[in-house]
């Protein structure tokens, strides 16, 4: 194959200036999958540069990416999802650099949504729930979620909880009373598919109750 050296000794002979990274999203638009690539150096002059993917495709040998400002993008049903594809940066017919990538190992899930927190007075806890479009998907159905929360005044002091369901209970006694909290969630593939964390969901803000002096318990909001 053109576009890369033929043995280990020459493997770094490619032009480092054109290093890039990609992520895939499966069933992102109905049954269509997407592949997004971008150069790691934002200063690369992309004027004449194109991306092409070949191999592990259905019915076609290669597909060309569309350029959307700084990113390159494909939306298609034609990913075989088994075997490695060769993704190349090209100028005309010349390949500048290529990567062999299995699209099932670079999956980035869609961000969770509808995050909310409900205080249960009787149970003295907070029930965190959120939704994910992946519950309806046929491929990347199993995700690990990362719920992160912090007291609003503690800028970088996030507490993280990993879970596989879309519901989490936070005990009231683990949180500061009468404080404003920010909470958000993201997802990563689990079971067969591999890849990257999704974007964070929009943050949700909630306030913990005051401590009730007579009982030592928090007052509801």
């Amino acid at each position: 194959e053109s576009g890369y050296a033929q043995n280990g000794d020459l493997e770094d002979a490619e032009l480092d200036d054109y290093s890039f990274s990609c992520y895939s999203q499966l069933e992102v638009n109905g049954s269509q999958h997407s592949l997004t690539c971008a150069f790691e150096d934002p200063d690369v002059n992309i004027t004449n540069l194109e991306f092409e993917i070949c191999g592990a495709l259905v019915e076609v040998k290669c597909l060309n990416f569309r350029k959307l400002q700084e990113i390159y993008f494909i939306e298609t049903k034609k990913f075989l999802l088994i075997g490695k594809s060769n993704i190349c940066v090209k100028v005309g017919e010349k390949s500048l650099t290529c990567k062999k990538i299995d699209l099932t190992t670079i999956v980035k899930p869609e961000a969770p949504f509808d995050l909310s927190v409900v205080y249960r007075e009787g149970a003295n806890d907070f029930v965190v729930t959120f939704n994910t479009s992946h519950l309806q998907k046929k491929y990347v159905k199993v995700l690990m979620h990362d719920v992160a929360y912090r007291q609003e005044k503690d800028e970088n002091k996030w507490t993280h909880v990993n879970l596989s369901s879309t519901k989490l209970t936070l005990l009231q006694r683990k949180l500061q009373p009468a404080a404003m909290y920010e909470i958000k969630v993201r997802s990563i593939p689990d079971h067969y598919f591999k890849g990257f964390w999704s974007e964070w969901s929009p943050s949700y803000y909630f306030r913990t109750p005051e401590i009730n002096n007579s009982s030592g318990e928090m007052d509801p909001i």
Partner: antibody
Framework: QVQLVQSGAEVKKPGASVKVSCKAS????????LHWVRQAPGQGLEWMGG????????AYNQKFKGRVTMTSDRSTSTVYMELSSLRSEDTAVYYC???????????WGQGTTVTVSS | DIVLTQSPDSLAVSLGERATINCRTS??????????MHWYQQKPGQPPKLLIY???NLESGVPDRFSGSGSETDFTLTISSLQAEDVAVYYC?????????FGGGTKVEIK
Amino acid sequence: QVQLVQSGAEVKKPGASVKVSCKASGYRFTDYELHWVRQAPGQGLEWMGGIDPKTGGTAYNQKFKGRVTMTSDRSTSTVYMELSSLRSEDTAVYYCARSGGRWYFDVWGQGTTVTVSS
Amino acid sequence: DIVLTQSPDSLAVSLGERATINCRTSESVSIHLLHLMHWYQQKPGQPPKLLIYGASNLESGVPDRFSGSGSETDFTLTISSLQAEDVAVYYCQQSIKDPYTFGGGTKVEIK
């Protein structure tokens, strides 16, 4: 053409270790994971584990955990499989195999016979 | 571990006739349309050779008399017209879950 060439046959005593090599050529070494599969005499195939030459990351069959170590040398495009605490039931042909995808094996080495005998 | 059971253990077929080998798994090896089942041919004294990957995709250079089908837990390798050079042991293999396991093999001979 794409080739995996393995080291020669070995005879070992029980309790010893063996290290088998597999040299890749004809493709970019870091593009594909390399795995080890063994076959006892007259028996079927058994996956032992694999290594990603790009990162050095490994995945081992739990059955061999603690006894098997897989390494790679990018400068020579070679991977190694070391199996320790050998016993007679480790007598087998050991194959290295390239993973064309997750996880099927599209190119195989010629095999290395390891005999464990006192 | 996922157990792969091949049937029959051995098969004698006349030249030019169809040979069918089955592989049943102890749990599903499919994720929707992604079927993580592969087939190999092994001749005496040689390493295995990949024939079919992803249940039905023919490996480059493999004659099109070989075909694969199936999903979930039941898969089939078919040789549409057996040739003398097809005498070998055939193995199925799953790759959905570590450890990646093989079937016990099916020996194909000429009747």
